[in-house]
């Protein structure tokens, strides 16, 4: 029946991802600005950069990568959204000024192994946790 | 040495959350504004707002709450920021026009319950994961 | 009691600029959002802009995109509308009002008048 | 965007009339977020209904709002003599915030 058409259109939007039946949405900040969807960004970043050659001796850098882009309405299943980032997605609909869209995030990340001197000019090979950025999401 | 001093605070940087010596940063968006740092904000959903209230039996809505604020150099201990994030930020001082801010999002979510009726008009109650959100954090 | 008192409009040609202030007070500033809303003489009401309670977010109707910026300071409880590269059509009374979460605008101002024109 | 088409453009009553204004919006809408202002002239707009149909404060009950969906009413049972002005409906869930092109109601 219609009635249980639309329970099941407000049902899905609520728990699951929706098709995405239009573009990622205006920016919020850049007037008529097209922002495209949450993704990965490919990044490489090098420890000089960072001013970090002095105690880092390996990598030179690596491939951290990071996560842009919109979370607008309709989130689609690419976006990886949580349920209450489809709920926040939809509050934010109807108040934008109050409620900010979901953030485009991390949802799998990875470590490397850093050889670095330590305060005693020690050589250290460590594991640094949530360091690469595998995949984004809508949180 | 200052050099090994030099690398504490580089390795500090990189490894674990720093003081922050200064307020929470200005906002990208409008000039002089200060925007308050990364936190959880209090939202209470009503379901009969979302359009949700023919399938919805209870409860008529929820403390949803969400994550909004600056993830801005220095991140403090409060900002559960991970080692990526730091990373980021600092990437973003020096390239902000390339790489953004990393966001404020969702650390820790809740589950509720939630009685409604299904497409066949069967009651039924049910627990949605992810739908509170309980902290905030820089990711 | 909430009162929200607009100033700034006036007589500018057209491609010329204008800074309209709404000062506000009896309530929380920084805790509501807020609209600039405009009436072109005889017509009906087209919303302009809004902006968060931070200041952090701002949206704006298509037709002023670009031209217009919308910006407060919280410490001094004012609200702010630059106009640049006005044309004749954005000739209107420029209302702000509050909105409430949820909620539509309540109260208004009493509105300033901006002429565009050679 | 919603646009919300008002009928008529104008009315013309007595006092002591019923008055019945309808807003038509070009796609479904909560009704949890359609308001209704009256505007007297030389005078900013005055909220009179949220919500479709709950009363704003210091608003006389002979005002009423209803509808659902894509059709909603203002109802004015007992038109007073300062009723006679314009009345305009509003979508505020969400940017761009779009008003009705307003009905006049005036004195036959």
């Known amino acids: 029946s219609a009635s249980s058409r639309r329970r099941q259109q407000s049902r899905n939007r609520s728990t699951q991802s929706q098709d995405v039946s239009r573009g990622s949405g205006s920016s919020d900040y850049n007037g008529s600005e097209l922002k495209t969807a949450c993704k990965k960004h490919e990044l490489y970043v090098s420890f000089q950069d960072l001013g970090w050659q002095d105690w880092i001796i390996a990598p030179k850098g690596y491939a951290a990568n990071y996560c842009d882009g919109e979370c607008s309405f309709p989130l689609n299943a690419h976006m990886n959204a949580t349920n209450h980032a489809i709920v926040q997605t939809l509050v934010h609909l109807m108040n934008p000024e109050y409620v900010p869209k979901p953030c485009c995030a991390p949802t799998k990340l990875n470590a490397i192994s850093v050889l670095y001197f330590d305060d005693n000019s020690n050589v250290i090979l460590k594991k640094y946790r949530n360091m690469v950025v595998r995949a984004c999401g809508c949180h | 040495s200052a050099s090994s001093r030099r690398r504490q605070q580089s390795r500090n940087r990189s490894t674990q959350s720093q003081d922050v010596s200064r307020g929470s940063g200005s906002s990208d968006y409008n000039g002089s504004e200060l925007k308050t740092a990364c936190k959880k904000h209090e939202l209470y959903v009503s379901f009969q707002d979302l359009g949700w209230q023919d399938w919805i039996i209870a409860p008529k809505g929820y403390a949803a709450n969400y994550c909004d604020g600056e993830c801005s150099f220095p991140l403090n201990a409060h900002m559960n920021a991970t080692n990526h994030a730091i990373v980021q930020t600092l990437v973003h001082l020096m390239n902000p026009e390339y790489v953004p801010k990393p966001c404020c999002a969702p650390t820790k979510l809740n589950a509720i319950s939630v009685l409604y009726f299904d497409d066949n008009s069967n009651v039924i109650l049910k627990k949605y994961r992810n739908m509170v959100v309980r902290a905030c954090g820089c990711h | 009691e909430v009162q929200l008192v607009e100033s700034g409009g006036g007589l500018v040609q057209p491609g010329g600029s204008l800074r309209l202030s709404c000062a506000a007070s009896?309530?929380?500033?920084?805790?509501?959002?807020m609209s600039w809303v405009r009436q072109a003489p005889g017509k009906g009401l087209e919303w302009v802009s809004a902006?968060?309670?931070?200041?952090?977010?701002?949206y704006y109707t298509d037709s002023v995109k670009g031209r217009f910026t919308m910006s407060r300071d919280n410490s001094k409880n004012t609200l702010y509308l630059q106009m640049n590269s006005l044309r004749a059509e954005d000739t209107a009374v420029y209302y702000c009002?509050?909105?409430?979460?949820?909620?539509?605008?309540?109260?208004w101002g009493q509105g300033t008048l901006v002429t565009v024109s050679s | 965007e919603i646009v919300l088409t008002q009928s008529p453009g104008t009315l013309s009553l007595s006092p002591g009339e019923g008055a019945t204004l309808s807003c038509r919006a070009s796609?479904?809408?909560?009704?949890?977020?359609l308001a209704w202002y009256q505007q007297k002239p030389g005078q900013a707009p005055r909220l009179l209904i949220y919500?479709?149909?709950s009363r704003a404060t210091g608003i006389p009950d002979r005002f009423s709002g209803s509808g659902s969906g894509t059709d909603f009413t203002l109802t004015i049972s007992r038109l007073e003599p300062e009723d006679f002005v314009v009345y305009y409906c509003?979508?505020?869930?969400?940017?761009?915030?779009?008003f009705g092109g307003g009905t006049k109601v005036e004195i036959k």
């Open positions: 902006i968060s309670g931070s200041g952090g977010r701002t």
């Open positions: 509003q979508h505020f869930g969400g940017t761009p915030f779009t």
């Open positions: 919500g479709a149909s």
């Open positions: 796609q479904s809408v909560s009704s949890s977020y």
């Open positions: 009896g309530f929380t500033f920084s805790s509501y959002a």
């Open positions: 009002a509050k909105r409430p979460y949820n909620s539509p605008f309540d109260p």
